[in-house]
Structure formats: structure tokens, C-alpha cells
């Protein structure tokens, strides 16, 4: 705590300006009125205060607003935002997207800090859902944002927001997250024609069920191998050799290079070898001709 000392004569700040950078910490504490600081927060950013001086300014605001800063102050915090702790931010009620953008701008180019994560969480919870404009803003600053959310949090994303998602925003999503996002994307894009639909849905296909992959195989979509390798294994297993051939089109040749990796490996094990041979790729490991496939779950059911 900075000691409470009287402001020296003639040093009382009438406005927030560059002269304050020459004030010692105790002088800032004594001579800058907190209410004045709050109304002229927009000026702080333009003045090259030291970190120690910023600590004093933050302390003054904390004293003025012990229950949390009003949005009019938050919007103009600028670099002072970097001094805030997650505990400070939890007291805020941020409702304006402009405020959110202003604070994210301060942290631009850096990893998502605990402060930013808390800010976003407060903002989204305040809105009740992750709407399109918010998602647009967040993914612009943090392309990996969507994949940092839990499946439970993703369930609050309305299908209309999916239009804001770019392929790179899904790069780090795991299957559980795509399981939640895929049905939303399917709903969002279903009014498009078949070929346009595939372009839009492609990034989300890691969450697609078997029936939708079978439907895509009827559409001559020519899925690339990278997309195929991200598909759910359980969704791929029921696909026939003919369906996979139609689904991949000219990319089917890439299966050979991936035959030891999931989901290709597991899919091969479920196919008849003579069906695999029709691809002419030399894929091995299918069920030999004339062999019976024993399903252990079925054996258990019958016993």
C-alpha cells in the first residue's frame, strides 16, 4: 500500500496528461483524483507511464470501485488491463462487444492470458450464448479459441454462429468438440446446394456420423485424405469399399500411405480382402475370402 501523504502545493492534477509521468508514485497517489482518472481513462493509454505508476493508477480505481469497474472505465483501460488479475475481472460486467475488442487489442499477438480467458468467460456468460459477432471477434484474435472450449461450453453456440467459423479455427479441436459442433454446422448449412454444402461442412466432418458420410459418398465430393484421417473411426467402419472409393474419388490412392494409421487401419480390418483388392492399391489385412467374422458382442448376447 502506498502511504497516504498530502499532495504538494500546486501539484494537484486538473487533468490526466503527460506531466504526470514526472510524478513519483506517492505524488500520483496523493495528487490524482480517482474520479478524474475514471472520467479521463482514455488518455492514460497515450501517456508512457511506468509499470509502477500504472500500479498506483490501478490502486486508485480499485478504491473508487471496490465492487468492480463500470463498463465506461473498462472500455478505456488500455494497457492498464494487463495489470488486472482474474479476480479483478470477475467483478466486471462487460456487455459491449466494443469493450471486448478494445481489451483484446491490448493483448494482441500474445497467448491467451488468464486475464483474457476470464474476460471472455464473463462476456460470453453475460450474453448467454456465443453469438456470431462474438465468435467472429474471438476467432479473429485467437484462431484456436473455439477448440479451447469444453464440449459443454460449445453446446451454447447457436447454429447461426457457425457461419463465423473458418477452417483454421478448428485445427486443434478434438473429436469430442467436433461431435458437438458438427450437428450445428449441418443445421447451419443445410439450405445450401450439395457442392457448396460440402465445402462449408468439410472442416467439421470429424464429428460426422456414418449416415452422413454415406450420403457424401453419393455426391462425388472427392474428400482429401487429411479430412478422411480426421473422421471418427466408429463412423468410418460401416463404410463399404465402394463408398470409400466414391467418397475419396481420385484421393483414394492415398489410403496406401495411411494403411497403418487410424481410421484406415481399423477400416481395412473390417473389409473383405477381395473387396479391398478391387481398389488395386495393395491394401492388406482384410478378412480372407470364405472366413466368418465373429462379433464378440454377439457371442456374449447369444450365450
Amino acid at each position: 500500500e502506498v502511504e497516504k501523504t498530502a499532495c504538494p502545493s500546486g501539484k494537484k492534477a486538473r487533468e490526466i496528461d503527460e506531466s504526470l509521468i514526472f510524478y513519483k508514485k506517492w505524488e500520483l497517489e496523493a495528487c490524482v483524483d480517482a474520479a478524474l482518472l475514471a472520467t479521463q481513462m482514455d488518455r492514460v493509454n497515450a501517456i508512457p507511464f511506468t509499470y509502477e505508476q500504472l500500479d498506483v493508477l490501478k490502486h486508485k480505481l480499485d478504491e473508487l470501485y471496490p465492487q468492480g469497474y463500470p463498463e465506461s472505465v473498462i472500455q478505456h483501460l488500455g494497457y492498464l488491463f494487463l495489470k488486472m488479475s482474474p479476480e479483478d475481472i470477475r467483478k466486471w460486467n462487460v456487455t459491449s462487444l466494443e469493450t471486448l475488442k478494445a481489451l483484446l487489442e491490448v493483448n494482441k499477438g500474445h497467448e491467451m492470458s488468464p486475464q483474457v480467458a476470464t474476460l471472455i468467460d464473463r462476456f460470453v456468460k453475460g450474453r448467454g450464448q456465443l453469438d456470431k459477432d462474438t465468435l467472429d471477434t474471438l476467432t479473429a484474435f485467437y484462431p484456436g479459441y473455439l477448440c479451447s472450449l469444453s464440449p459443454e461450453e460449445l453446446s451454447s453456440v447457436p447454429p447461426s454462429s457457425i457461419w463465423a467459423v473458418r477452417p483454421q479455427d478448428l485445427d486443434t479441436c478434438d473429436p469430442r468438440q467436433l461431435d458437438v459442433l458438427y450437428p450445428k454446422a449441418r443445421l447451419a448449412f443445410q439450405n445450401m446446394n450439395g457442392s457448396e454444402y460440402f465445402v462449408k461442412i468439410q472442416s467439421f466432418l470429424g464429428g460426422a456420423p456414418t449416415e452422413d458420410l454415406k450420403a457424401l459418398s453419393q455426391q462425388n465430393v472427392s474428400m482429401d485424405l487429411a479430412t478422411f484421417m480426421k473422421l471418427r473411426t466408429d463412423a468410418v467402419l460401416p463404410l463399404t469399399v465402394a463408398e470409400v472409393q466414391k467418397l475419396l474419388g481420385p484421393h483414394v490412392e492415398g489410403l496406401k500411405a495411411e494403411e497403418r494409421h487410424r481410421p484406415v487401419r481399423d477400416w481395412i480390418l473390417r473389409q473383405r480382402q477381395d473387396d479391398l483388392d478391387t481398389l488395386g492399391l495393395g491394401l492388406q489385412g482384410g478378412i480372407p475370402n470364405g472366413y466368418l467374422v465373429l462379433d464378440l458382442s454377439m457371442q456374449e448376447a447369444l450365450s
Epitope: 443445410q190 457424401l216 467402419l237 463399404t240 473390417r270
Partner: antibody, heavy 122, light 107 residues
Framework: QVQLVESGGGVVQPGRSLRLSCAAS????????MHWVRQAPGKGLEWVAA????????YYADSVKGRFTISRDNSKNMLYLQMNSLRAEDTAVYYC???????????????WGQGTLVTVSS | EIVLTQSPDFQSVTPKEKVTITCRAS??????LHWYRQKPDQSPKLLIK???QSFSGVPSRFSGGGSGTDFTLTINSLEAEDAATYYC?????????FGQGTKVEIK
């Protein structure tokens, strides 16, 4: 919510024609394959016909091929089954059903109408 | 066309009992076998898709297994509301076909 309502059933003489309709609502009709399935009184289910989302492909059971025609009007969210040269064995409750997938004819979904009864009798 | 044969045709079971219905295809259909339940005066409802995939909202007591030509539907602990006719259905090749149905009655 998804709703499928069949109409057009009734009593008809052998050799005559009948047209069944199915009004769809609660989903983007133009994105889904559609089916007709029938069930003779006290008997099992029989798949009758299917049509692609855009009407470009149609499929039929052997028992109705050449006699029945499936069609759709996406502007009206309507599915149709034109039944010609009706026989006594066509007597059944006719259900329209939506495909589970989007942009394909892949698997019958959980969405079926309540059915309309067609009785072929002299 | 592919013929699906279910067994048994009829089963009378006490509540909480385990029920197993089998479906045999006349030729290999991979995993393109689905199970439906039809209660009296209602349209059918999908239970299991692609042999073993549970359909959303279906109670966990229903499970499916098998591939190729032999398939099973298992109801682990039968409840009163499970009294219905159960159908297997193949979408592997046209024309699509159904089994003749298995009627499950509660004792």
C-alpha cells in the same frame, strides 16, 4: 419440430389409381431424401420407394416398379406417391418417412408420418 | 433382393429380463443393418443404426451387434414400455428390406 402428414388414402377398386401426398414441415425439406414405406394390416413393414433431396434419383421396390411413381415439390414441401394399376396386395397403411442423412438416400430416420390407409377392393 | 429373417417371431418376457432378437441376412450386408421398434398404432422408431450405433435419445438398455450376415438386438433389462414389434432393416443394397418382425409381449 419435424412433422410429416400423409393424405389421399381411401378405398379404390383394383386396376384404378390413387395419389398420396405427404406435407412436410419443421425442417429444410429440400435438403433431405424421402421415402414411402407401407404396412399391410397385421403384417410387417415394406419399403416402397425413395427419392433424392432434389428429385434427381428415384428407387422402387420390385413389387411396385412400373406401377408407382415417387415425386416431390420442394417449393411446396410436398412428397407424392402416384399409384397406378392398384392390386389387392397394395392394401396397407402408407407412411412417408424422412431420411436420417442430409443430401442422400441412406437410412430411414426416426421421422415418420402417422400413415394413411389405402384399401384396394372391388 | 436381400431377405432378412428374424428369430423368434414372438417372445413373452417378464420385466427386467434380458431379451435377444437375432436377424440373419441372405447375403453379407456389412454393417448396414438397423433396428426399429413399433408400438401398437404408432409409426416405427429407430433404435440402433449400423448394427451397433445407438440412436440419440434411445435408452442404454438397447444394444446391437454383429456384421456381415448375423446380427442381434439386445434389451438388457426389459421394461413394460418395451412391449412392441421389433424389426431389422437393411439399407446395404436396393431394394431395401425389413425382417418379418419379432413381437415382444410382457408377461
Amino acid at each position: 419440430q419435424v412433422q410429416l402428414v400423409e393424405s389421399g388414402g381411401g378405398v379404390v377398386q383394383p386396376g384404378r389409381s390413387l395419389r398420396l401426398s405427404c406435407a412436410a414441415s419443421g425442417f429444410t425439406f429440400s435438403s433431405y431424401g424421402m421415402h414411402w414405406v407401407r404396412q399391410a394390416p397385421g403384417k410387417g413393414l415394406e419399403w416402397v420407394a425413395a427419392i433424392w433431396y432434389d428429385g434427381s434419383n428415384k428407387y422402387y421396390a420390385d413389387s411396385v416398379k412400373g406401377r408407382f411413381t415417387i415425386s416431390r415439390d420442394n417449393s411446396k414441401n410436398m412428397l407424392y406417391l402416384q399409384m397406378n394399376s392398384l392390386r389387392a396386395e397394395d392394401t396397407a397403411v402408407y407412411y412417408c418417412a424422412r431420411d436420417l442423412s442430409i443430401f442422400g438416400v441412406v437410412i430411414l430416420s426416426d421421422y415418420w408420418g402417422q400413415g394413411t390407409l389405402v384399401t384396394v377392393s372391388s | 433382393e436381400i431377405v432378412l429373417t428374424q428369430s423368434p417371431d414372438f417372445q413373452s418376457v417378464t420385466p427386467k429380463e434380458k431379451v435377444t432378437i437375432t436377424c440373419r441376412a441372405s447375403q453379407s450386408i456389412g454393417s448396414s443393418l438397423h433396428w426399429y421398434r413399433q408400438k401398437p398404432d404408432q409409426s416405427p422408431k429407430l433404435l440402433i443404426k449400423y448394427a451397433s450405433q445407438s440412436f440419440s435419445g434411445v435408452p442404454s438398455r438397447f444394444s446391437g451387434g454383429g456384421s456381415g450376415t448375423d446380427f442381434t438386438l439386445t434389451i438388457n433389462s426389459l421394461e413394460a414400455e418395451d412391449a412392441a414389434t421389433y424389426y431389422c432393416h437393411q439399407s446395404s443394397s436396393l431394394p431395401w428390406t425389413f425382417g418379418q418382425g419379432t413381437k415382444v409381449e410382457i408377461k
